[in-house]
């Protein structure tokens, strides 16, 4: 069998979520010493990069102006070092948001309830869609999917204190394109009275890996980035739909 | 800076015969999928061809199988589109690209075009 390099990395640079008009940024972190990458858009070469100088950086950005729906889609990236390819990176899914119209989110039986209460969301769009997604920030990556005419539900069965948050919805007009965001519903669940003031509270940083960190190479810095970047592609997973 | 350039049409009595050709620089050509797309006045673009990068696989519009033939020269980073028995409907500019689903001359890298007029 030919002889390939490891896989890139692919990631969405802040998020894989992207306004409609608003540029997407996808990294490709691959090897220091490649001399060309490569950005798939649904298995056709849509962008070329050379870096320069190639043995001192380890990736590349891919910026993705004006997004819209049909450049919205499963994405991967591919280097080249010498006459080397890598294998194709995992595909990455980057949605295209404000699309047509917002929904309406809301929660039965109220935004503050307490441990142990079954909590359901109710997404409604008067518009024409048959999927709906609801999302927790700080989390975007669990995206769970539920179904309607108009509206759909969400039961979240009894919950916990780490159901606490902020939660919003869309509604999606196929896998790729969503509309507006709606409004955020923030969930407070209160627990046992004695544990209440010390259940920390949801963290709504954007997910550690929706950051590029393509860095340049300094003296010890090869080797602990090939480490890496092994480990990293033996733990990384991107599929999200 | 990635280039596609085409080259190779013309008028052409129908009945008649082109070669198209398109030069590639800038990326690894060889494995890379390549299309023909063309669009008529008027008219949406239509991918009328497809080859892998290896040339192991390639497609054709049903208006134009029997007719027209795919090939690549990935040494010379040269893709090319023989088209035989030209129709008046075949009347088109062609362009070469990167796009194998998107037909869209904004998506991708996609050449100038090169024009094809089959008239008597």
């Known amino acids: 069998p030919k002889q390939t390099l490891p896989k890139p990395i692919i990631r969405a640079e802040s998020t894989y979520m992207v306004p409609k008009e608003k540029q997407a940024t996808l990294c490709c972190q691959g090897s220091y010493g490649a001399v060309e990458y490569q950005l798939h858009f649904e298995g056709s070469l849509f962008a070329v990069e050379r870096p320069k100088p190639p043995e001192r950086i380890n990736g590349v950005k891919f910026h993705i102006p004006d997004m819209n729906s049909r450049k919205a889609g499963r994405y991967s990236c591919i280097y080249r070092v010498g006459e080397l390819w890598s294998e194709r990176s995992d595909l990455l899914d980057l949605v295209v948001t404000e699309m047509y119209d917002t929904p309406t989110l809301s929660v039965h039986p109220g935004p503050e309830v307490t441990s142990g209460e079954k909590v359901t969301f109710y997404c409604r769009l008067d518009t024409a869609t048959s999927m709906f997604l609801l999302l927790k920030e700080g989390r975007s990556r669990d995206v769970q999917r539920s179904y309607g005419k108009v509206q759909a539900e969400f039961p979240m069965g009894p919950v916990t204190t780490a159901h606490r948050g902020s939660y919003r919805c869309f509604g999606s007009y196929n896998n790729y394109a969503w509309s507006f965001p709606s409004e955020p519903v923030k969930l407070l669940v209160t627990g046992d009275i004695e544990n209440t003031s010390l259940a920390p509270t949801d963290p709504t940083f954007p997910d550690s890996w929706d950051t590029c960190l393509l860095t340049r190479e300094t003296g010890l810095q090869k080797d602990l980035a090939l480490w890496d970047h092994t480990a990293q592609n033996h733990h990384h997973h991107h599929h999200h739909h | 800076d990635v280039q596609l350039v085409e080259s190779g049409g013309g008028l052409v009595q129908p009945g008649g015969s082109l070669r198209l050709s398109c030069a590639i620089s800038?990326?690894?050509?060889?494995?890379?999928?390549m299309s023909w797309v063309r669009q008529a006045p008027g008219k949406g673009p239509e991918r009328v061809s497809w080859?892998?990068?290896?040339?192991?696989?390639?497609s054709y519009a049903d208006s134009v199988k029997g007719r027209f033939t795919i090939s690549r020269d990935n040494a010379r980073n040269m893709l090319y589109l023989q088209m035989n028995s030209l129709k008046s409907e075949d009347t088109a500019r062609y362009y070469c690209?990167?796009?194998?689903?998107?037909?869209?001359?904004?998506?991708?890298?996609w050449g100038q075009g090169t024009q094809v007029t089959v008239s008597s």
């Open positions: 690209t990167t796009q194998n689903s998107h037909y869209d001359i904004r998506f991708g890298y």
């Open positions: 080859i892998n990068g290896d040339s192991s696989n390639t």
């Open positions: 800038g990326f690894t050509f060889s494995i890379v999928s």
